[in-house]
């Protein structure tokens, strides 16, 4: 059976598949996917691996016309050096020669400078070329090589391996050498897979059921401690309670070199956040930090300095800290929009069970700002989701040069973040650069300004607008209000109506159903329209929603299905990359962003069209 | 950088108890192989009992089994040794010692290399 990583590589012109006979054959043969002889994997960026020989594809020079065979691998062999040139080209790196059927007098495959069919190569089964299953490093932990990645095949004993192993173990913990030949180098590390007793690994907190991993002589930089902790299905740790953060500074005492957790301001527009998603409401900075030099984006623990936070450049080399489990911050669901019939007072805008109002003109001092909205029967806004803050940003009124509180404050506990409406905090959207909490002056209260409704934390006592936000009292028969210019059923947002189609489709589908509703696949123009669709569907508990873009007419250009340029995106981390498929929001979490799916799969969807007795606006000229 | 700290010895009367401490300090327990070894006056240094770094999976010296046990706390980075029915016998200098992993596990690692080495902590048993 082909693991993931493996596969067969096939050329469509002939519909054979590369078979190693032996290490100075490689051929052709019909393909068979039980043949150990057809498998091969990326054993590095540029390495590909023969699974039955353990030895890589190379060549004796770059040069035209010679035979590819197979070579004990070595990472720094120019002749084992492969990238895939555009389309299904497989290419000797940094050179226009290719990998080759060969031809009727040549059965072993050669490198050419032909780019023909006979060049071009597909995984067997698929459309994508070799490079779409490509190579992952895999981060080690304890041992000796400091949290270096496998190296495989790696040489035991004289016998190679191109898998984490138990071998000379008698608990069967899997291990790799993190060098080709641990005979010599004596290098090894852990694998971060699932076996019996890996859990060993982790401390569990008693109270919380949470878990945490403290590699302490690891050397990485943080985006590879966060891909060590991701394949271990956790992530950097993230600390939002004040237990939390006492817990890990028992646990780390004992050492003194600083260890990566999840903190970063790696978002261009935002501030400061948690890799997990964890709203940032408690702070633990050392005295000084964050300092504000540019490219100090990430923030390591210091065991030494009494487990205080530091922000540091990401391309340090140090331990860091992993944490899986329990989080308390799922328990507190928030009802979909479509869930709960609101009902809001006059000049009262209704979503999801609550009702807000904008405050703008009458400016207050945060203390009084709350008074107000607790006459009113309700308080300063909480803000739970991303939802929720796209909701308030689209269709409040919410203004960009705005400056207004809202009901977060650190007034109880220093540091230590809370609404004022008692709700717990799950979600924070800072600015850049922020929460700065200036030590010169007391800055305990939040407010929401810029463009996009960050979050900046402010001194309690600045006249400024505010958001009040009450739950809606009328529970009676929800009116479905028809929207000028709209159908029933269709909401209006701007010039536009939309609909949520309910039947799972695939895209085809979902652009079909739209055009018979003389509507087409969502648009999205701007950041404005992205926040409405974002609180219009990103509640809800279905995972996806198709938006119009697809890659299905040129593979790497993303279109709409209507001639609309493509003049804003919303990508989800490590999207697009490089397979094609078509667009689909998603929900929850990671509400609103974009993820590349593929096409015949099914989800609901978004149908846009020209609300009734708009005039159209002139297309902007590029 | 590595640190060992023995803690806990004393002077005990024969059939007492005492609990013996280890505490590392300069990286985490689970990168090593602690052993806590002895040597009484004008003898050689013996292995008493070993923990491996990973899984804890425990070795002792046949004239210690069933008096002593060793444990381990990675949230402390301390590895302790209960000694209880202290015999006359067992009178030396207790050492701690932490050995880097390596990939091979037979299940002993009293006969590792050890490469750190605590200073040492003397244990009297005498009525």
């Known amino acids: 059976l082909l693991d993931t990583r493996q596969f067969l590589i096939y050329n469509e012109d002939h519909k054979r598949c590369v078979d190693a006979v032996s290490p100075s054959a490689v051929q052709t043969a019909a393909c068979n996917q039980d043949a150990e002889s057809q498998k091969f994997r990326w054993v590095s960026e540029s390495q590909i691996m023969s699974v039955a020989f353990k030895l890589c594809l190379g060549v004796p020079s770059k040069t035209d016309w010679v035979a590819i065979t197979l070579y004990a691998c070595d990472s720094k062999s120019e002749f084992q050096k492969w990238e895939c040139k555009n389309d299904t080209l497989l290419g000797i790196k940094g050179e226009d020669l290719f990998f080759n059927y060969g031809n009727r007098q040549e059965k072993n495959i050669m490198l050419y400078k032909g780019s023909g069919l006979w060049s071009r190569w597909k995984i067997y089964g698929t459309t994508d070329n070799l490079c779409s299953r490509g190579y992952e490093a895999m981060y080690t932990l304890l041992g000796n090589a400091n949290g270096a990645t496998c190296a495989f095949p790696f040489k035991f004993e004289n016998k190679w391996y191109a898998d984490c192993t138990s071998a000379g173990r008698s608990d069967g913990w899997l291990w790799c050498g993190t060098t080709t030949d641990y005979d010599t180098d004596k290098l090894f590390g852990y694998c971060p897979l699932k076996f019996e007793g890996s859990e060993s690994l982790w401390n569990k907190d008693p109270l919380t059921s949470v878990s945490y991993q403290i590699n302490s002589k690891s050397a990485l930089t943080w985006h590879q401690a966060r891909k060590s902790c991701q394949q271990q299905n956790a992530e950097l740790l993230s600390i939002t309670e004040i237990h939390e953060q006492t817990y890990l500074t028992g646990l780390t005492s004992s050492l003194t070199s600083g260890l990566w957790i999840g903190l970063n301001s790696l978002s261009f527009n935002s501030g400061w956040q948690w890799s997990d998603r964890s709203p940032f409401r408690y702070l633990n900075w050392l005295p000084g930090s964050p300092s504000a030099e540019p490219g100090k984006s990430c923030v390591s623990l210091n065991p030494g300095k009494n487990a205080k936070w530091e922000n540091l450049e990401c391309v340090q080399k140090l331990g860091y800290i992993c944490k899986k489990g329990n989080t308390t911050l799922n328990s507190f669901v928030i009802p979909s929009e479509s869930d709960v019939p609101t009902h809001c007072p006059s000049q009262w805008w209704p979503y999801a069970g609550h009702c807000y109002k904008i405050h703008r003109d009458e400016k207050k001092i945060q203390r009084d700002a709350l008074t107000t909205c607790r006459k009113e029967g309700g308080d300063l806004t909480s803000i739970h989701t991303i939802e929720e803050l796209d909701f308030i940003i689209s269709q409040l009124g919410y203004e960009p040069n705005d400056e207004l509180w809202i009901g977060l404050n650190d007034i109880k506990i220093q540091m230590y973040f809370e609404w004022s409406d008692g709700t717990p905090v799950t979600f924070t959207k800072w600015l850049r650069g922020e929460p700065s909490h200036e030590n010169n002056r007391q800055e305990d209260c939040v407010v929401m300004k810029g463009k996009d409704g960050y979050w900046a934390d402010r001194g309690c006592e600045w006249p400024l607008g505010y958001i009040c936000k009450m739950k809606s009292r009328s529970q009676g028969p929800e009116i479905v209000e028809v929207e000028k210019g709209c159908r029933k059923g269709w909401k209006k947002h701007h010039f536009y109506c939309y609909m949520i189609g309910h039947t799972l489709s695939t895209f085809a589908e979902a652009n079909q159903t739209c055009n018979n509703e003389n509507a087409y696949l969502t648009t999205i123009e701007d950041r404005y329209e992205q926040a409405f669709l974002t609180s219009f569907v990103g509640l809800r508990p279905e995972k996806y929603f198709w938006t119009g873009l697809s890659d299905i007419q040129t593979k790497g250009t993303f279109q709409w299905t209507i001639e609309e340029e493509v003049r804003f995106t919303h990508w989800n981390s490590d999207m697009p990359g490089r397979k094609p498929g078509c667009v689909a929001m998603r929900t929850g979490i990671a509400g609103g962003l974009w993820d590349v799916l593929k096409c015949d799969e099914k989800a609901k969807f978004v149908c846009k069209h020209w609300a009734e007795g708009v005039t159209h606006p002139p297309k902007p000229t590029t | 950088q590595v640190q060992l700290q023995e803690s806990g010895g004393g002077l005990v009367q024969p059939g007492e108890s005492l609990r013996l401490s280890c505490k590392l300090s300069?990286?985490?327990?689970?990168?090593?192989?602690i052993g806590w070894f002895r040597q009484a006056p004008g003898k050689e240094r013996e292995g008493v009992s070993c923990?491996?770094?990973?899984?804890?999976?425990?070795n002792y010296a046949d004239s210690v089994k069933g008096r002593f046990t060793i444990s381990r706390d990675n949230v402390k980075n301390t590895v302790y040794l209960q000694m209880n029915s202290l015999k006359p016998e067992d009178t030396a200098i207790y050492y701690c010692?932490?050995?880097?992993?390596?990939?091979?596990?037979?299940?002993?690692?009293?006969?590792?290399?050890?490469?750190?080495w605590g200073q040492g902590i003397q244990v009297t048993v005498s009525s």
């Open positions: 923990i491996s770094s990973i899984g804890g999976s425990a």
């Open positions: 010692a932490a050995e880097a992993q390596t990939p091979y596990n037979d299940g002993d690692c009293t006969r590792a290399s050890y490469d750190y």
């Open positions: 300069g990286f985490t327990l689970d990168y090593y192989d």
